[in-house]
Amino acid sequence: MKVLQEPTCVSDYMSISTCEWKMNGPTNCSTELRLLYQLVFLLSEAHTCIPENNGGAGCVCHLLMDDVVSADNYTLDLWAGQQLLWKGSFKPSEHVKPRAPGNLTVHTNVSDTLLLTWSNPYPPDNYLYNHLTYAVNIWSENDPADFRIYNVTYLEPSLRIAASTLKSGISYRARVRAWAQCYNTTWSEWSPSTKWHNSYREPFEQH
């Protein structure tokens, strides 16, 4: 049994890091493998992660972490029984994938303005709470070409757009994702999408 693709890990910079790897053949990850991880810090205990299958030869492990600070570094040992298959390390702050925003809501009752709001996925005491920026994706269910991205570079989790920038009388969907420049993170997954019917009063044409 050998590792074909070495583990790569990403952290949500809160409580979970996810590591994925591939074996050289079909593997029952949960019965055959264990991923041991330990913070390089005095008196930190080693923890064991039981991996799950992720495709035939792929494995994924969700490492639980009490908290994360930027200096943290973990040793990782992948074991098959008594055999050490791979040894490495992982610094969560250098491989951050933020949590996806939640509670995306479209408020359509504000005088021909669409107000989109969502929730920051981090608690106020987490470093990323004040460092997230967002991308909002809006698309038409009727017209695949009607697809747009709004970059929200301020901290407030909201976006205002004129309803008239979208077509009237048709349904739209929106979703939002996050990233943090300070840690050069990857983008989060998209939030679940929300749907609304766009309608607004056309201005009277003057002849």
Epitope: V40, F41, L42, L43, S44, D67, S70, A71
Partner: antibody, heavy 117, light 108 residues
């Protein structure tokens, strides 16, 4: 409200023993690395010993190795320090500390240990 | 034997800014040393100010800030107040936890 209350200090003769206790409340004791830190009269702070959150790993300053034993009872939210073969140099205020350096740290008010004949 | 170095004493005028440093007798302080800062006033137990280089303990005023500058950890007090007069200790993760000798800060 978070609290750490040390007890068990006192006056002891050189070569004698004492057992310090630290009762914790107001936080999840079992999640914290715990330490004992001491301060001799008119001197600075010295880390003495520490124990992992689950109690499986311990560490000691060279000055107390082989004489002091740290332990914890997570069911009772209590930290202990068994001190044997005490020397006059061990005279100090002993503080119980939750979470040094890496997370928010909380200190007890301390208990006085005096080693004198 | 790891020795953590601090200025024995410093003074600052009320409203002024002062920077305390925390170094190693050999080598540089990095974030992997998780520098922490502790304040102690006479007759009181120490209290935590800064942990993991720059994170402020809850309840600590924003005039206290921690960082690493050059090869040392630093604690900066901006807009010093009379109640900031105290002993300040740094500690580093270096095999074990090692405290510095402390800095006596006078506000005058």
């Amino acid at each position: 409200q978070l609290q750490l209350v040390e007890s068990g200090g006192g006056l002891v003769q050189p070569g004698g023993s004492l057992r310090l206790s630290c009762a914790a409340s107001g936080f999840t004791f079992s999640s914290y690395i715990m330490s004992w830190v001491r301060q001799a009269p008119g001197k600075g702070l010295e880390w003495v010993s520490g124990i992992s959150s689950g109690g499986g790993i311990t560490a000691y300053a060279d000055s107390v190795k082989g004489r002091f034993t740290i332990s914890r009872d997570n069911a009772k939210n209590t930290l202990y320090l068994q001190m044997n073969s005490l020397k006059p140099d061990d005279t100090a205020v002993y503080y119980c500390v939750a979470g040094l350096l890496r997370v928010e740290g909380y200190w007890g008010q301390g208990t006085q240990v005096t080693v004198s004949s | 034997q790891t020795v953590v170095t601090q200025e024995p004493s410093l003074s600052v005028s009320p409203g002024g800014t002062v920077t305390l440093t925390c170094g190693l007798s050999s080598g540089s302080v990095t974030s992997s040393n998780y520098p922490g800062w502790y304040q102690q006033t006479p007759g009181q137990a120490p209290r935590s100010l800064i942990y993991a280089t720059a994170s402020r303990h809850s309840g600590v005023p924003s005039r206290y800030s921690g960082s690493i500058s050059g090869n040392k950890a630093t604690l900066t007090i901006t807009g010093a107040e009379p109640e900031d007069e105290a002993d300040y200790y740094c500690a580093l993760h270096k095999g074990t936890y090692v405290f510095g000798g402390g800095t006596k800060l006078t506000v005058l």
